[in-house]
């Protein structure tokens, strides 16, 4: 289902992207699901829609709810849902679990902490960083673009890291904070050339025309923290984002798992409303890390619906 959880704090800016993506030329309409009321596009409103983005400038607790976005093209409409929750600011230092973004792991060799969701905002450096509510000071900490680098990482560096930045909209400034946990792993691991668990090489996947289909690219990269590792899909040798078919989307973010102690990643390719022309495409699952790239190719074939007539 094309639904996404988003959260923010009252009196801060919150920008939410429609989970259904399309070409920039496509129009996107936003509605408040409970009332089916259209979200205005005029920027003078505190809450307004701007193409694929829904902006709360600033957010209020009462804004919580489910918002519907409809991507409209000349040939189709696609619907997505943004489940938005705005929380009151905490008086104490503790950041509750429901405000935390995904945990990242680091090691002596790799200690980047990315500021979550920052790419959605119009921000300018510097980015401020806090650990357990204390401003980070000292030469070991380097704020670089949208991430924090910690030199000579130690186990004591584990904790909750908050990034704070200013979003600018038409000359007005709004504060944004985002918090995620950072864990430190022992460098006891090793890295392998990527091993793709699924799909099998030259796999043929049966799909039904008009139905939705999912393809999962799953690969393992070694044990412990991996310096560089990614899985992704390509269509006819082209990145999904460049291919320009809104019906075919990669799941945002990569799911990390540990299989037999190995660090693995998977990426789901979602094809909505499968069409005949989708059967002609070559789907490449790419797994890559420091050592290199392994590619498994999948093709789709039509699954014949079972004939229930005798």
């Amino acid at each position: 289902k094309f639904s996404k959880q988003s959260w923010g704090l009252e009196n801060e800016a919150l920008i939410v992207r429609c989970p259904r993506q399309g070409k920039p030329s496509y129009t996107v309409d936003w509605y408040y699901s409970q009332t089916n009321k259209s979200i205005p596009t005029q920027e003078r409103n505190r809450v307004f829609a701007s193409g694929q983005l829904l902006k709360f400038l600033p957010a209020a607790v009462a804004d919580s709810g489910i918002y519907t976005c409809i991507v409209r093209s000349p040939t189709f409409n696609r619907t997505g849902y943004a489940n938005v929750t705005i929380y009151k600011k905490q008086s104490d230092c503790n950041v509750p679990d429901y405000l935390m973004y995904s945990t990242v792991s680091g090691s002596e060799k790799n200690s980047k902490i990315y500021c979550p969701t920052i790419d959605l905002y119009n921000w300018t450096a510097p980015l401020e960083w806090f650990k357990n509510c204390q401003a980070l000071q000292g030469s070991r900490y380097r704020a670089h673009k949208s991430f924090l680098v910690i030199d000579n990482v130690m186990t004591e560096d584990a904790g909750d890291y908050t990034c704070k930045f200013i979003h600018n909209e038409n000359g007005a400034n709004y504060s944004v904070t985002a918090t995620r946990s950072f864990t430190v792993k022992d460098e006891q691991g090793f890295s392998l050339f990527p091993v793709i668990g699924a799909p099998a090489q030259n796999e043929i996947k049966e799909v039904e025309i008009g139905k939705n289909a999912n393809l999962t690219c799953s690969a393992c990269f070694g044990k412990g923290t991996q310096f560089l590792a990614a899985v992704l899909w390509q269509l006819n040798g082209t990145k999904i984002t460049d291919f320009g078919e809104p019906r075919i989307q990669q799941e945002e973010g990569q799911n990390q798992s540990f299989s037999n102690g190995l660090a693995c990643l998977d990426m789901v390719l979602r094809i909505a409303d499968v069409k005949e022309e989708d059967l002609l495409l070559q789907y490449d699952c790419l797994a890559l890390n420091l050592h290199g790239l392994r590619r498994h190719t999948v093709r789709l074939s039509r699954k014949n619906p079972i004939d229930h007539h005798s």
């Epitope: 060799k109 992704l232 890559l288 290199g292 392994r294």
Partner: antibody
Framework: EVQLLESGAEVKKPGSSVKVSCKAS????????ISWVRQAPGQGLEWMGG????????NYAQKFQGRVTITADESTSTAYMELSSLRSEDTAVYYC?????????????????WGKGTTVTVSS | DIQMTQSPSSLSASVGDRVTITCRAS??????LAWYQQKPGKAPKLLIY???NLKTGVPSRFSGSGSGTDFTLTISSLQPEDFATYYC?????????FGGGTKVEIK
């Protein structure tokens, strides 16, 4: 078969910067890794850093951190290496190199394809 | 950084000789090792990858062995075109590092 074409020789003054380009043809540029390796006269090979366009990030040897910037332009299939605050010890041949394919695998950092090298001379 | 130490730094040999060059890593690099040949004024040429895999098109007189920290490049019967400098390189971790090189000269 991938081919790498490097820009021409450069003569630079100490303290200045140099930007060397490496244009790739053949294959899918975004999937390559491009490494930059230098060799001072009569010396061995030294890896400066590399970029994997599909990752969009560059990695550098500590020795060059802060002085070297490696970028890639996917639209022109060109990688660049810029070295700043040049000193006489930076006089060297600068090679770009990419990995190789073997049995559906693409090895990033086993360097199979090399440019001819760009000679950079730093002299006052 | 992982240090790669090659020995000897140079050697003299005759055509037909068996030549062995060793490379030692400062920590285990599994089999993430390559061997290159470089002739004066030319770019290096990849000979062996993954410590023991011969790249297609490289003569079978070249072979590689070892894993962990100790590696060997062997030329079973030296030919006139083999006189060159040989380098090992690890790709186990960033930064990539090369050995200092072994120059094989005519005796």
């Amino acid at each position: 078969e991938v081919q790498l074409l490097e820009s021409g020789a450069e003569v630079k003054k100490p303290g200045s910067s140099v930007k060397v380009s490496c244009k790739a043809s053949g294959g899918t540029f975004s999937s390559y890794a491009i490494s930059w390796v230098r060799q001072a006269p009569g010396q061995g090979l030294e890896w400066m850093g590399g970029i994997i366009p599909i990752f969009g990030t560059a990695n550098y040897a500590q020795k060059f951190q802060g002085r070297v910037t490696i970028t890639a332009d996917e639209s022109t299939s060109t990688a660049y290496m810029e070295l700043s605050s040049l000193r006489s010890e930076d006089t060297a041949v600068y090679y770009c190199a990419s990995g190789f394919y073997s049995n559906d695998l693409y090895y990033y950092y086993y360097m199979d394809v090399w440019g001819k090298g760009t000679t950079v001379t730093v002299s006052s | 950084d992982i240090q790669m130490t090659q020995s000897p730094s140079s050697l003299s040999a005759s055509v037909g000789d068996r030549v062995t060059i060793t490379c030692r890593a400062s920590q285990s690099i599994s089999s993430w090792l390559a061997w290159y040949q470089q002739k004066p004024g030319k770019a290096p040429k990849l000979l062996i990858y993954d410590a023991s895999n011969l790249k297609t098109g490289v003569p079978s007189r070249f072979s590689g062995s070892g894993s962990g920290t100790d590696f060997t490049l062997t030329i079973s019967s030296l030919q006139p075109e083999d006189f060159a400098t040989y380098y090992c390189q690890q790709t186990y971790a960033i930064p990539l590092t090369f050995g200092g090189g072994t120059k094989v000269e005519i005796k």
